[in-house]
Amino acid sequence: LPAQVAFTPYAPEPGGTCRLREYYDQTAQMCCSKCPPGQHAKVFCTKTSDTVCDSCEDSTYTQLWNWVPECLSCGSRCSSDQVETQACTREQNRICTCRPGWYCALSKQEGCRLCAQLRKCRPGFGVARPGTETSDVVCKPCAPGTFSNTTSSTDICRPHQICHVVAIPGNASMDAVCTSTSPTRSMAPGAVHLPQPVSTRSQHTQPTPAPSTAPGTSFLLPVGPSPPAEGSTGD
């Protein structure tokens, strides 16, 4: 004969364990039902009655089968330098990621605590290393024969145009000015074309949000703006 199916609550076999989606209640000394994601244990089980589950209250969640007395509080609303990539629901926490043009300057166990604006390279400097989700732009001076006339977090140094007759020679922050009508572009040394920077908005990581106060302010951490690196601007 097949073994009789036990209904919760039930006493486990000596040395045995409770089944999937059940937990052992120390007080009742019984195997009892866990609550599904989106719910929590409103009343714990006894020897004669199973766990009573209830829906998570507004702005709280449980992601796993559980027997917690209260659901977990969702993180604060995303600050102005972040985008909400996952809403707070009964079954999942809010996820905030840095918006395009920003990167995560201070990460936490999961996700980002503080977003910072990507550095912009000033004229005469180009992007040596593009910004990523978790790292800032690195600027470098434009090598001879190349220039950048923009303040940008994405523009690299570009080669000067080659003139048949030069009206004004180019420098690190200005292209050459020709008198002829058909200039050509040199492939000057150092005119490396970098790939476009990756978006700072994650589509695959699942950080938990940092609680935020007013938009754009950090929570608990007195982190001021870092001094701009050489060739960068604080804009």
Epitope: D58, S59, C74, R77, A87, T89, T213
Partner: antibody
Framework: QVQLVQSGSELKKPGASVKVSCKAS????????MHWVRQAPGQGLEWMGR????????KHDPKFQDKAVLSSDTSVSTAYLQISSLKAEDTAVYYC?????????????WGQGTLVTVSS | DIQMTQSPSSLSASVGDRVTITCTAS???????LHWYQQKPGKAPKLLIY???NLPSGVPSRFSGSGSGTDFTLTISSLQAEDAATYYC?????????FGQGTKVEIK
């Protein structure tokens, strides 16, 4: 755009009942709560209760537990507040307001209000 | 129940003045669950500040909020004529959710 449109003013006699409706448009009724707040003439705001339209679960201020019945019909995106055993002191403007799940109860859109007058 | 007490109950100030309204809770309220509403005569309330210090889109930056625990503040940095209204704080920390009694702001 998001809109909450309430039914018109009501004049009722003491002891009667009234049912106020609040029709929602411009958003998904899922993952929101619909609250009812009352305001007696010249007085402040008083939270009465709320309903989760997706599940029908309700929560009341105990003061209104036996007075107000909250319901909703998702097929017509409408929430209802029924007040029974009306008394003169129930004369008030009744507002519906929504709060999205996860916004910590911030009521971001309100109906225009329904004036209920109880007089013999 | 958590009682919310606002002060002052009413005030009169001139255009350009800095106005501060305080809201004191009878027990601690998480800052995420404290909101402010503005209500003009004959109109429905409007969400002015959510989660203690955050402004919904369209709310002028002269409005700001701060506080924690039991003491919260709404500030209007430079009062404008259109700010004449009654302001309510609201806690959603513990049911039943409650409002302050309101602060009426008049323009001198």
């Amino acid at each position: 755009q998001v809109q909450l449109v309430q039914s018109g003013s009501e004049l009722k006699k003491p002891g009667a009942s009234v049912k106020v409706s609040c029709k929602a448009s411009g958003f998904n009724n899922k993952d929101i709560y619909m609250h009812w707040v009352r305001q007696a003439p010249g007085q402040g705001l008083e939270w009465m209760g709320r309903i989760d339209p997706a599940t029908g679960n309700t929560k009341h201020d105990p003061k209104f537990q036996d007075k107000a019945v909250l319901s909703s019909d998702t097929s017509v995106s409408t929430a209802y507040l029924q007040i029974s055993s009306l008394k003169a002191e129930d004369t008030a403007v009744y507002y519906c307001a929504r709060s999205p799940y996860g916004d910590f109860g911030a009521m971001d859109y309100w109906g225009q209000g329904t004036l209920v007058t109880v007089s013999s | 129940d958590i009682q919310m007490t606002q002060s002052p109950s009413s005030l009169s100030a001139s255009v350009g003045d800095r106005v501060t309204i305080t809201c004191t809770a009878s027990s601690s309220v998480s800052s995420n669950y404290l909101h402010w509403y503005q209500q003009k005569p004959g109109k429905a309330p409007k969400l002015l500040i959510y989660s203690t210090s955050n402004l919904p889109s369209g709310v002028p930056s002269r409005f700001s909020g701060s506080g924690s625990g039991t003491d919260f503040t709404l500030t209007i940095s430079s009062l404008q004529a259109e700010d004449a209204a009654t302001y309510y704080c609201h806690q959603y920390h513990r049911s039943p959710w409650t409002f302050g009694q309101g602060t009426k702001v008049e323009i001198k």
